[in-house]
Interface confidence: medium
């Protein structure tokens, strides 16, 4: 057993057919020694009396808010969790697999840019009684400090019969530097409790490996003379790192008709412009890498041709 | 400061070119030892990430952008540094600084030249000849190292007697390469970096 | 001991909003877990739930009649009150309030009272 | 929603005799499922929770079990007081959703 915040106390389980479960001591938080008894969940029904409540937890039957009381007036609480173990495995029942890029991806994370500012996000088709607690660090043995907000609700998607929730939360690294080559890994950990349930989640990075550029800005079509040329150009995302000639990006130009079917023409280039074909109802995106660094390319930036 | 990106113009300055064949010749190693060392640990997620040149080089310091010089966090471990009186540099000064940087640079591909040669005289002799370090990738070392145009002492390569560890050594490379792209990637950034300066 | 009793009028008239009151005793809801479920079931049929509130003012209603549903909550008079505009015909039915603990299951419930939806 | 399909509507048994009653979520719930007993002109009143935890003072003849969409009540050897509607009710997701009920009779 152990706390995870103020009397709030996770007690971690074998899950099989007839274990035997943990023997938990609930000391009651007060000077009195006498005439205490033990409720479960604001039930009227006495567990026990005395200081110290000792219980056989099994299963979440045997959870939840235990009070301890002296003549009618409530003394203290001490709620415990249950942390299932199965095979060996901690249970994972309350995050979805969001099997991208691998199988057993519960968190996803992704950067904007080298400024140590980084956002998670899961998925879980739990949409009350939940709650998320987010830590993270740079290393794990000798931690150096990283900031976490509050998890919150950004999107709910229906997948089919289901409807799922995605919650998101925005982390900054404390002391990072741009440019800094990354040795040790970010670490981000995340404490789930659904009901009387405590699940936790890990996910470990370099920040290098999740950069993830916003799409080009002002994107602008300028029609050549006598030509069915245009020249396409566009400008390094507000959110990209800087100075951009060392934080450089490479552009991919796309040119695709109105069917999806329709062939593709599509030139990179290092340069905030190019020259392009632009067909009848076709249209014109532009997504952005890191030059040098080959991680995520950003979503488009488009435009049509007319 | 959003300077244009120039095209590589080897005579405005040859190392951008070089330095950006480096890049090219160690990822695409570091891929062909991913592939063939399937079975050993070579991700980035698998491997320690340890820096042969750490203590002995100081590259992302000698080599920061002026822009990053008034981040804190960048300056922690700086001996050097390039802020002046009122952050003004004088020419004398920015020429000084970028020779830091190019001979940190010039230092650290000396150090992974002598451990990959080491490392590829143990994988000739294993009796899987299962990889094999490419040439291609010591020559574009060479090139650029030649392109800096600093003149130092050639460091003999180590010689062991020793009948070497060959699952060690593979993972060695994997370590070695996974830190020597990295150090590619800041190599690379600070060549485009002066070349737009 | 713990009892919830649910209050309001009997007969209302189409249209009309219907207001109605839990009270409860032997828990608060001023402590956390706890929370308070409003839940009906016309004449002969299963039970639907309509909208639940919690210890900290977090509210969920039954997305089907979320627009004519507002549930909310005296701490001090250990209250909570359901109200349900444009009533019609087909939402007479026993109406039930009931507490829901952290074991997230409905352990106690009022007796019900009984709306009709009639002109 | 969370649609609970619960089967049979209705039951004719003897006493003594063993009931099984069955619920099936569109979705998986977890053991987010509760069992509900309301005897004629009375409210509801919890059985099991957690799809298989017997509520204080439940008789150890009723039993649930089940995880994900699958689950099952049983009361074991039944008596003339067990004559009553029973509900399943899933509360993994809101809007939390009832089972049709299963209508007990004894003969």
């Known amino acids: 057993i152990w706390e995870l915040k103020k009397d709030v106390y996770v007690v971690e389980l074998d899950w099989y057919p007839d274990a035997p479960g943990e023997m938990v001591v609930l000391t009651c938080d007060t000077p009195e020694e006498d005439g205490i008894t033990w409720t479960l969940d604001q039930s009227s029904e006495v567990l026990g009396s005395g200081k110290t409540l000792t219980i056989q937890v099994k299963e979440f039957g045997d959870a939840g808010q235990y009070t301890c009381h002296k003549g009618g007036e409530v003394l203290s609480h001490s709620l415990l969790l249950l942390h299932k173990k199965e095979d060996g495995i901690w249970s994972t029942d309350i995050l979805k697999d969001q099997k991208e890029p691998k199988n057993k991806t519960f968190l996803r994370c992704e950067a904007k840019n080298y400024s140590g500012r980084f956002t998670c996000w899961w998925l879980t088709t739990i949409s009350t009684d939940l709650t998320f607690s987010v830590k993270s660090s740079r290393g794990s043995s000798d931690p150096q400090g990283v900031t976490c907000g509050a998890a919150t609700l950004s999107a709910e998607r229906v997948r089919g019969d289901n409807k799922e929730y995605e919650y998101s939360v925005e982390c900054q690294e404390d002391s990072a530097c741009p440019a800094a080559e990354e040795s040790l890994p970010i670490e981000v950990m995340v404490d789930a409790v659904h009901k009387l349930k405590y699940e936790n989640y890990t996910s470990s990075f370099f920040i290098r490996d999740i950069i993830k550029p916003d799409p080009p800005k002002n994107l602008q079509l300028k029609p050549l003379k006598n030509s069915r040329q245009v020249e396409v150009s566009w400008e390094y995302p507000d959110t990209w790192s800087t100075p951009h000639s060392y934080f450089s990006l490479t552009f991919c130009v796309q040119v695709q008709g109105k069917s999806k079917r329709e062939k593709k023409d599509r030139v990179f280039t290092d340069k905030t412009s190019a020259t392009v074909i632009c067909r009848k109802n076709a249209s014109i995106s532009v997504r952005a890498q890191d030059r040098y660094y080959s991680s995520s390319w950003s979503e488009w930036a488009s435009v049509p041709c007319s | 400061r959003n300077l244009p990106v120039a095209t590589p113009d080897p005579g405005m300055f040859p190392c951008l070119h070089h330095s950006q064949n480096l890049l090219r010749a160690v990822s695409n190693m570091l891929q062909k030892a991913r592939q063939t060392l399937e079975f050993y640990p070579c991700t980035s997620e698998e491997i320690d990430h340890e820096d042969i040149t750490k203590d002995k080089t100081s590259t992302v310091e000698a080599c920061l952008p002026l822009e990053l010089t008034k981040n804190e966090s960048c300056l922690n471990s700086r001996e050097t540094s390039f802020i002046t009186n009122g952050s003004c540099l004088a020419s004398r000064k920015t020429s000084f600084m970028m020779a830091l940087c190019l001979s940190s640079i010039y230092e650290d591909l000396k150090m992974y030249q002598v451990e990959f040669k080491t490392m590829n005289a143990k994988l000739l002799m294993d009796p899987k000849r299962q990889i094999f370090l490419d040439q291609n990738m010591l020559a574009v070392i060479d090139e650029l190292m030649q392109a800096l145009n600093f003149n130092s002492e050639t460091v003999p390569q180590k010689s062991s007697l020793e009948e070497p560890d060959f699952y060690k050594t593979k993972i060695k490379l994997c370590i070695l390469l996974h830190a020597f792209r990295i150090r590619a990637v800041t190599i690379d950034r600070v060549m485009s970096y002066l070349n737009a300066s | 001991e713990v009892t919830l009793r649910e209050s309001g009028p009997a007969l209302v008239k189409p249209t009309q909003t219907l207001t109605l009151t839990c009270t409860f005793s032997g828990f608060s809801l001023s402590k956390s877990v706890m929370g308070v479920s409003w839940i009906r079931q016309p004449p002969g049929k299963a039970l639907e739930w309509l909208a639940h509130i919690y210890w900290d003012d977090d509210k969920y209603y039954n997305p089907s009649l979320k627009s004519r549903l507002t549930i909310s909550k005296d701490t001090s008079k250990n209250q909570v009150v359901l109200t349900m505009t444009n009533m019609d015909p087909v939402d007479t039915a026993t109406y039930y309030c009931?507490?829901?603990?952290?074991?997230?299951?409905?352990?106690?419930w009022g007796q019900g009272t009984t709306v009709t939806v009639s002109s | 929603s969370v649609v609970m399909t619960q089967t049979p509507k209705f039951l004719l048994v003897s006493a003594g005799d063993r009931v099984t009653i069955t619920c099936k979520a569109s979705q998986s719930v977890s053991n987010d499922v509760a069992w509900y007993q309301q005897k004629p002109g009375q409210s509801p009143k919890l059985l099991i929770y957690y799809a298989s935890n017997r509520y204080t003072g439940v008789p150890d003849r009723f039993t649930g079990s089940g995880y994900g969409t699958d689950f099952t009540f049983i009361i074991s050897t039944v008596r003339a007081e067990d004559l009553a509607v029973y509900f399943c009710?899933?509360?993994?997701?809101?809007?939390?959703?009832f089972g049709g009920g299963t209508k007990l009779e004894i003969k």
């Open positions: 009710q899933q509360d993994y997701n809101s809007p939390w959703t």
């Open positions: 009931a507490r829901r603990g952290i074991r997230s299951a409905m352990d106690y």
